[in-house]
């Protein structure tokens, strides 16, 4: 018999779930990283390949599953999915925070205007990881 | 704690301008939108603008659009209001204010008073 | 600008429960995260409820924040003295692109 099929996570439940992890951490999943994504379209597709790798963060499991069901939401959702930068690889908790930006926006406006926000974030992310290594 | 500490309020003349500060602490600023508030005297609130975390995300009440400008600075972790051809109805309290979920604040600044009157 | 609707006062005496509404449309309430925040006379506002339900630490269980559909309430149980004064709601609307706020209530403590 075909499996009940369960309703797509709205905007604003992916928001809390987002605010909820990330709200007053310094890092997820031990510091993992992760493939950084170019936020141009397939957004949660592309979010979700690259926090997939992410195993035993038991953390961003709900958020996993949220991206799993909007990814699939539409028919050609999965080929609409945004490059994933191979060069940059940032924190998950990063990660995280830009997706949070996104959907924000996305949720304020539909067509998000403040995608410049995440390449800023990515930008302070990579400088400041930089930074960090270059004084230890 | 969180703090939020506006300055900029004063008298001033219609058609003038103004800038209001909001210097924000106790809290990662870069992580939050960021919206004004306002509250005439004896009326209710009334919103004014919001910043998304980054700042390119801005959006106004069509109270204010055209006239007022929201920016921030997350190096100074400070907003600001830049406001221009002040009427007498923008005479209010305004709040600086912190969003936890978009259009849900968690934390109010203290308010600063701006009259605009001849 | 479109506000919530909010009854402009309600009463109750000390001890009791009263409940305070917040009605809006689809394009609000029936999607947005409700806020409710307390003004006491003189003073900036203070958020009671964020998120529809969530309570900021140091404000008493006594506050209780639901949502039905285009509707919120906030629900104040074991009514005191202090209790008086204005509230408000607010929830973001996606078709005008706006932070809305309800019109305030003004609740009187009856002793």
């Known amino acids: 018999s075909p499996s009940p099929v369960t309703p797509s996570p709205t905007l604003k439940e992916l928001i809390e779930e987002l605010v909820n992890i990330t709200q007053n951490q310094a890092s997820l999943c031990n510091g993992s990283m992760v493939w950084s994504v170019n936020l141009t379209a397939g957004m949660y597709c592309a979010a979700l390949e690259s926090l997939i790798n992410v195993s035993d963060c038991s953390a961003i499991q709900r958020t996993q599953r949220m991206l799993k069901a909007l990814c699939s939401q539409k028919p050609a959702a999965g080929q609409i999915s945004s490059e994933r930068s191979r060069d940059t690889k940032i924190e998950v908790i990063q990660l995280v925070k830009n997706l949070l930006t996104y959907v924000r926006g996305v949720y304020r406006h539909g067509n998000f205007r403040g995608l410049n926000d995440i390449f800023e974030a990515q930008k302070i992310e990579w400088h400041e990881h930089h930074h960090h290594h270059h004084h230890h | 704690e969180v703090q939020l500490v506006e300055s900029g309020g004063d008298l001033v003349k219609p058609g003038g301008s103004l800038r209001l500060s909001c210097a924000a602490s106790g809290f990662t600023f870069t992580d939050y939108d960021m919206s004004w508030v306002r509250q005439a005297p004896g009326k209710g609130l009334q919103w004014v603008a919001t910043?998304?975390?980054?700042?390119?995300?801005?959006y106004y009440s069509d109270a204010v659009k055209g006239r007022f400008t929201i920016s921030r600075d997350n190096a100074k972790n400070t907003l600001y209001l830049e406001m221009n051809r002040l009427r007498a109805e923008d005479t209010a309290v305004y709040y600086c204010?912190?969003?936890?979920?978009?259009?849900?604040?968690?934390?109010w600044g203290l308010g600063t008073l701006v009259t605009v009157s001849s | 600008q479109a506000v919530l609707n909010q009854p402009a006062s309600v009463s109750g005496s000390l001890g009791q429960r009263v409940t305070i509404s917040c009605s809006g449309s689809s394009s609000n309430i029936g999607r947005g995260f409700v806020g409710w925040y307390q003004q006491l006379p003189g003073t900036r506002p203070k958020t009671l409820i964020y998120?529809?339900?969530f309570r900021p630490s140091g404000v008493p269980d006594r506050f209780f924040g639901s949502r039905s559909g285009s509707t919120a309430t906030l629900t104040i149980s074991g009514l005191q003295a202090e209790d008086e004064a204005d509230y408000y709601c607010?929830?973001?609307?996606?078709?005008?692109?706006?932070?809305?706020f309800g019109g305030g209530t003004h609740l009187t403590v009856l002793g």
């Open positions: 204010v912190k969003e936890i979920y978009p259009a849900s604040i968690d934390f």
């Open positions: 910043t998304s975390n980054g700042g390119s995300g801005t």
């Open positions: 607010s929830t973001w609307d996606d078709s005008l692109a706006a932070l809305l």
């Open positions: 998120g529809d339900t």
